[in-house]
């Protein structure tokens, strides 16, 4: 909407106004070899905004770096045209941009933390939610699967929109949209579970808008390392959301003596960080260089978007990758503490579990251990990559492999350890799990490097799609499915209750190891996709008209 | 159509044990919650048991009441429900009604929509 | 446990009258009441579910209304055979509870 340098609270249409006609401004001095522009200097010769400086800041309108002398811009000026100098005018740069930027990143980290806490107490609640209801457990299923298939539904959907409106809009009327949709269903009438199921799926649509949109405002503001450091932020807040969520829900509950009141937190927290983004995200333009943004929006249809992403090999490698993560996550989340239950009743450490919820314990300890390998995963994926960035071109993908790879060891030896010792299964999943989820930060940075700009919210929906439609979407359901399937040829006892689950439950390896595979493969051609992502940002960068959509 | 029928109830000295068994036809025993409620000579209605199909892991809830003495069971083979009766009390004595839950396939209602004609469980020493 | 209060435990009326029957819950309990008649040795049946859903194959004189804590059972112009003890049943959690009934009686 302007030029962050030079307004990072004021909004509006004159602004954008004046944006575009200090880019097209920009755009001539640019023909004639300036050097820079405005308050937002031409990107160097080192590619698609990818600058070697650390202390680079990635604006609006493409990359600059901080100016050493001078004073501060003035904030709260309408736009970079009325302050640059001229075509070549290297304008100085806010004290408060930095701050500004971080402060955005932490407000869409903060709403993907609500996000899922959002979605994880209702998880914390659901046996209330069952009881109060009279929900079966084929009800459960359909509560969770409405939700998913709505969000994977409304992914690709809101992906369109991202790339074509304001992103920032999109992204509060999401969180408004989900927030007063959970409100609503805490006061949903016993015999209306339908009602019930219908929310969820409206829950599931709102905030698919959150997760397919957000990662790419992130992806505008910084470049480099830094964007590396702050999606790794944005995705620690699924683990911590998801705890927190646990938490919320059964805390809530029990301070105010009725499960309904769980459903009324995170709304009100949702209602205010709405609000937040409205405020203090800035509407920034789609790419380092924004000169290519409003041309592409008007140049690409939603097919050709989808064309491009599926010739785009280290997107579809690393998506099908991130789809055996979604795999492995959903199938272990679902089953490992009914498994490490059953392997308590083999060894005779705990009693055979009549009436639910069996393995509540081990659900808490696997909920914590969730929470903070998250945080491990997403820490130790990212500092990896910083550092093997410096040894080779390929290091995200890699590392993603390499931790994929070594994850697979540790979830197959979860199954060796169970037998007979519960604290070695515990530790196998911990380290398992760590390693699973390094690359959480690192496969949406693989995606911001090799999709453009303003595809990037189309490619986050349709890699979110895929990895909910090929991942946890079905693979409780088929772990579930083999483990019965297992236990109807063998006879009944506790030992093949949990050899059968154990057994069906060794996909999951498997399908890792595949995603493993996907990364090695992903990390053959990130580079070459790489170059070509940059050199479409450069092409388009200087087209021969503006045009405003 | 919906039939529900009780046997089992009679006359025990306090401290001992009475199965009451209730058999149905005309839906779906499977699919569908059962529960046995009771009325004492004279009095009020008290819900006593409930178990959940199949689907809901056949669990099983308990009024305060009689809870560690009195087990509530399905066979979805014979499509019968029971309720096993241990450390009788005066108290017990009662009119036992088996009763259905309707079904709605992905939820139930908690409440009762077909009952039995009862049984009656008289305990006295 | 939800505690359930019927009001009043007996009322005399003539045939053709119209009665309004209370059920007041300890909690906000939403909608979840349902209303049981039970005939003299007799089991008893179901008459209104969720305070107001109407039960197929059961007279439309009987009708339910309320939410909250305040619930009513109406029969418009009561019939003989309407004579009998009228229990109200919460479900909103368990312990499932009932009310202890209302008698209704010829004046």
């Known amino acids: 909407m302007m030029c962050l340098e030079c307004a990072s609270a004021a909004a509006g249409g004159a602004e954008e106004e004046e944006a575009d006609a200090e880019r097209r401004r920009r755009r001539r001095g640019a023909q004639r070899g300036a050097g820079g522009s405005g308050c937002c200097g031409a990107r160097g010769a080192g590619g698609a905004g990818v600058s070697a400086a650390g202390d680079e800041v990635q604006t609006l309108s493409g990359s600059v770096r901080r100016a050493p002398t001078g004073p501060p811009g003035t904030p709260g000026t309408p736009g970079c045209a009325a302050t640059a100098k001229g075509p070549g005018a290297q304008q100085p740069k806010p004290a408060s941009l930095g701050r500004g930027r971080g402060a955005a990143a932490a407000i869409l980290s903060l709403g993907n933390v609500l996000n899922y806490l959002d979605r994880y107490t209702v998880a914390g609640v659901l046996l209330d939610i069952q009881q109060h209801f009279g929900v079966k457990d084929r009800g459960a299923g359909l509560l969770q699967s409405v939700f998913i298939c709505s969000f994977m539904v409304a992914a690709p959907i809101f992906g369109y929109l991202g790339d074509r409106f304001n992103r920032k809009v999109i992204l509060s009327c999401g969180i408004f949209f989900w927030s007063a949709v959970t409100f609503s269903s805490s006061f949903i009438p016993q015999q209306y579970f339908w009602l019930l199921a219908l929310s969820r799926g409206l829950v599931g649509i709102g905030e698919a808008s959150y997760s397919t949109i957000a990662p790419t405002i992130i992806g505008d503001l910084f470049t480099k390392n830094t964007r590396t450091l702050m999606l790794s932020v944005f995705y620690f807040a699924i683990p911590l959301g998801s705890g927190l969520g646990y938490i919320t829900g059964s805390s809530v509950k029990q301070a105010a003596g009725d499960w309904h009141w769980a459903l009324r937190v995170s709304p009100v927290l949702g209602m205010i960080t709405g609000t937040l983004i409205l405020i203090l995200v800035p509407a920034t333009k789609r790419g380092h260089a924004d000169q290519l943004g409003d041309q592409l929006k008007a140049r690409t249809s939603w097919l050709r978007d989808m064309k491009a992403l599926i010739r785009n090999r280290s997107y579809v490698f690393s998506s099908l990758a991130t789809s055996a993560v979604s795999f492995a996550t959903g199938a272990l989340g679902m089953w490992i503490p009914l498994y490490l239950h059953r392997a308590q009743v083999v060894q005779k450490t705990a009693e055979t579990c009549n009436s639910p919820p069996c393995g509540a314990k081990d659900s808490l300890i696997f909920g914590a251990i969730t929470c903070f390998t998250g945080f491990l995963g997403v820490v130790t994926g990212a500092g990896a990559t910083r550092w093997c960035r410096l040894k080779t071109q390929r290091a995200d993908p890699l590392v993603c492999a390499v931790g994929m790879l070594g994850s697979a060891i540790f979830i197959c030896l979860i199954f060796v350890a169970a037998k007979s010792s519960i604290v070695g299964a515990y530790i196998c999943i911990f380290v398992g799990e760590t390693l699973l989820f390094s690359n959480w930060a690192i496969t949406a940075d693989i995606l911001m490097y090799v999709v453009i700009p303003t595809r990037r919210a189309t490619a986050v929906a349709l890699q979110s799609f895929t990895s909910h439609l090929l991942g946890d979407a079905g693979s409780p359901y088929l772990i579930g499915f083999i483990s019965d399937l297992i236990r109807q040829s063998t006879k009944d006892s506790p030992l093949w209750e949990f050899l059968s689950l154990g057994y069906a439950l060794m996909l999951c390896p498997f399908v890792v190891v595949l995603g493993g595979m996907f990364f090695l493969a992903t990390a053959l051609f990130f580079v070459s996709d790489r170059a070509r992502a940059e050199q479409q940002v450069n092409q388009l960068a200087m087209p021969p008209a503006s045009v405003k959509v | 159509e919906v039939q529900l029928v009780e046997t089992g109830g009679g006359l025990v000295r306090p401290g001992s044990s009475l199965k009451l068994s209730c058999a149905t036809s005309?839906?779906?025993?499977?699919?569908?919650?059962m529960s046995w409620v009771r009325q004492a000579p004279g009095k009020g209605l008290e819900w006593v048991a409930l178990?959940?199909?199949?689907?809901?892991?056949?669990?099983?809830n308990y009024a305060e009441s009689i809870k560690g003495r009195f087990t509530i069971s399905r066979d979805d083979s014979k499509s019968r429900v029971y309720l096993q009766m241990n450390t009788l009390r005066d108290q017990d004595t009662a009119t036992y009604y088996c009763?259905?839950?309707?079904?709605?396939?992905?939820?139930?209602?908690?409440?009762?929509?077909?009952w039995g004609q009862g049984v009656m469980v008289t305990v006295s020493s | 446990d939800i505690v359930l209060t019927q009001s009043p435990p007996t009322l005399s009326v003539t045939p053709g009258e119209s009665v309004s029957l209370s059920c007041r819950a300890s909690?906000?309990?939403?909608?979840?009441i349902h209303w049981y008649q039970q005939r003299s040795n007799e089991s008893p049946r179901l008459l209104i579910k969720?305070?107001?859903q109407s039960i197929a194959g059961i007279p439309s004189r009987f009708s339910g209304s309320g939410s909250g804590t305040d619930f009513i059972l109406s029969i418009n112009r009561v019939e003989s055979e309407d004579f009998s003890v009228y229990y109200c049943?919460?479900?909103?959690?368990?312990?499932?509870?009932f009310g202890p009934g209302t008698k209704l009686e010829v004046k």
């Open positions: 009763t259905r839950h309707e079904d709605f396939y992905y939820y139930s209602g908690y409440y009762f929509d077909y």
């Open positions: 005309g839906f779906t025993f499977s699919d569908t919650w």
């Open positions: 178990i959940k199909d199949k689907n809901s892991n056949s669990e099983a």
């Open positions: 909690q906000g309990i939403s909608t979840s």
């Open positions: 969720y305070a107001s």
């Open positions: 049943q919460q479900t909103y959690s368990l312990p499932l509870t």
